[in-house]
């Protein structure tokens, strides 16, 4: 026997109190699939959240963060304060990266500079709070008669996948 509720489309709910007829979702609620026995309450983007997509009867609202904050968690469940490059967010707010570490983004933590000597290379460009060191050729490669230096490949910005 077919469930009469299975005929209720998205944007409606199957009303137990009215002989299982399909009733439209009330304001501020939605059902994204058919056959639902309740509409769900729309997410509200308040405070540091702002509305990226309004709620409709068939889909939930989507939030992002106001300027100065960035999304964290599935579906932007949290907004975290941005810091400047060269800083990281701590419980006490944005703090400069310690010497020997860097952060080239407005989010995330300070990471140690690359240790060039581990790869047998020399430091070509010193690191800063905002940038990692650039490792050059190994000291042996710099001896007279060695082939010319090829510049290092640019580092890909972490946290971004290729387009």
């Amino acid at each position: 026997l077919q469930d009469p509720c299975s005929n209720c489309p998205a944007g409606t709910f199957c009303d137990n109190n009215r002989n299982q007829i399909c009733s439209p979702c009330p304001p501020n609620s939605f059902s994204s699939a058919g056959g639902q026995r309740t509409c769900d309450i729309c997410r509200q983007c308040k405070g540091v959240f702002r509305t990226r997509k309004e709620c409709s009867s068939t889909s939930n609202a989507e939030c992002d963060c106001t300027p100065g904050f960035h999304c964290l968690g599935a579906g932007c469940s949290m907004c975290e304060q941005d810091c400047k490059q060269g800083q990281e967010l701590t419980k006490k707010g944005c703090k400069d990266c310690c010497f020997g570490t860097f952060n080239d983004q407005k989010r995330g933590i300070c990471r140690p500079w690359t240790n060039c000597s581990l790869d047998g290379k020399s430091v070509l460009v010193n690191g800063t709070k905002e940038r990692d060191v650039v490792c050059g050729p190994s000291p042996a490669d710099l001896s007279p008669g060695a082939s010319s230096v090829t510049p290092p490949a640019p580092a890909r910005e972490p946290g971004h996948s290729p387009q």
């Epitope: 709910f13 137990n16 109190n17 501020n28 699939a33 309740t38 509409c39 509200q44």
Partner: antibody
């Protein structure tokens, strides 16, 4: 008859987490939404959030978004709430309450007996 | 969020007296629900959608109102009505409750 039976009292230290349960019986668990509410000693009622056991969809009071996690197990008709990073202000009775979403009125028609959580060092 | 303010906070009444509890919303709401809570017990569903009495609620109770002003009325109050009464809305997220009105029967 329709019943919501909640887990027993808990005593926790600040910074700890607590997970409480709410077992439903006497009705079809997935036809109703399950809400969680807080009542601090001598205070009024505060809505924490709800879960739709049918879909797993959750909606939270923004005040509790980062510390409360609601889940539901359809196989045992049980809803759970985990509260993390506990502090003294979390000392309260926590209720689960059923709402007939199909009435579209969001009215809590059946309540659990409450779980008392005490946060103390 | 919508703030619900109940008045009075505390009411003392004698049996057979008429009691009125008011719930005012900071902005317009579609309907109000009422709950009764006795000390040491869970709240109980009392009146839904402004005026529908929950199962088992005596007919001396009634509810009315619209927009920003709602009332719960007890026509001839009885000793068993001593409790705290809460109003609740969901016209806007989050669900909110009034602070409660404690009713004492002398």
């Amino acid at each position: 008859q329709v019943q919501l039976v909640q887990s027993g009292a808990e005593v926790k230290k600040p910074g700890a987490s607590v997970k409480m349960s709410c077992k439903a019986s006497g009705y079809t668990f997935t036809f109703y939404t399950m809400h969680w509410l807080k009542q601090a000693p001598g205070q009024g009622l505060e809505w924490i959030g709800y879960i739709n056991p049918s879909s797993g969809y959750t909606n939270y009071n923004q005040k509790f978004t980062d510390r409360a996690t609601l889940t539901a197990d359809k196989s045992t008709s049980t809803a759970y709430m985990e509260l993390s990073s506990l502090r003294s202000e979390d000392t309260a009775v926590y209720y689960c309450a059923r709402s007939d979403g199909s009435s579209s009125k969001w009215y809590f028609d059946v309540w659990g007996q409450g779980t008392t959580v005490t946060v103390s060092s | 969020e919508i703030v619900l303010t109940q008045s009075p906070d505390f009411q003392s009444a004698t049996p057979k007296e008429k009691v009125t509890i008011t719930c005012r919303a900071s902005s317009s709401v579609s309907y109000i629900h009422w709950y009764q809570q006795k000390p040491g017990s869970s709240p109980k569903a009392w009146i839904s959608a402004t005026s529908n009495l929950a199962s088992g609620v005596p007919s001396r109770f009634s509810g009315s109102g619209s927009g920003t002003s709602y009332t719960l009325t007890i026509n001839r109050v009885e000793a068993e009505d001593a409790a705290t009464y809460y109003c609740q809305q969901w016209s806007s997220n989050p669900f909110t409750f009034g602070q409660g009105t404690k009713l004492e029967i002398k």
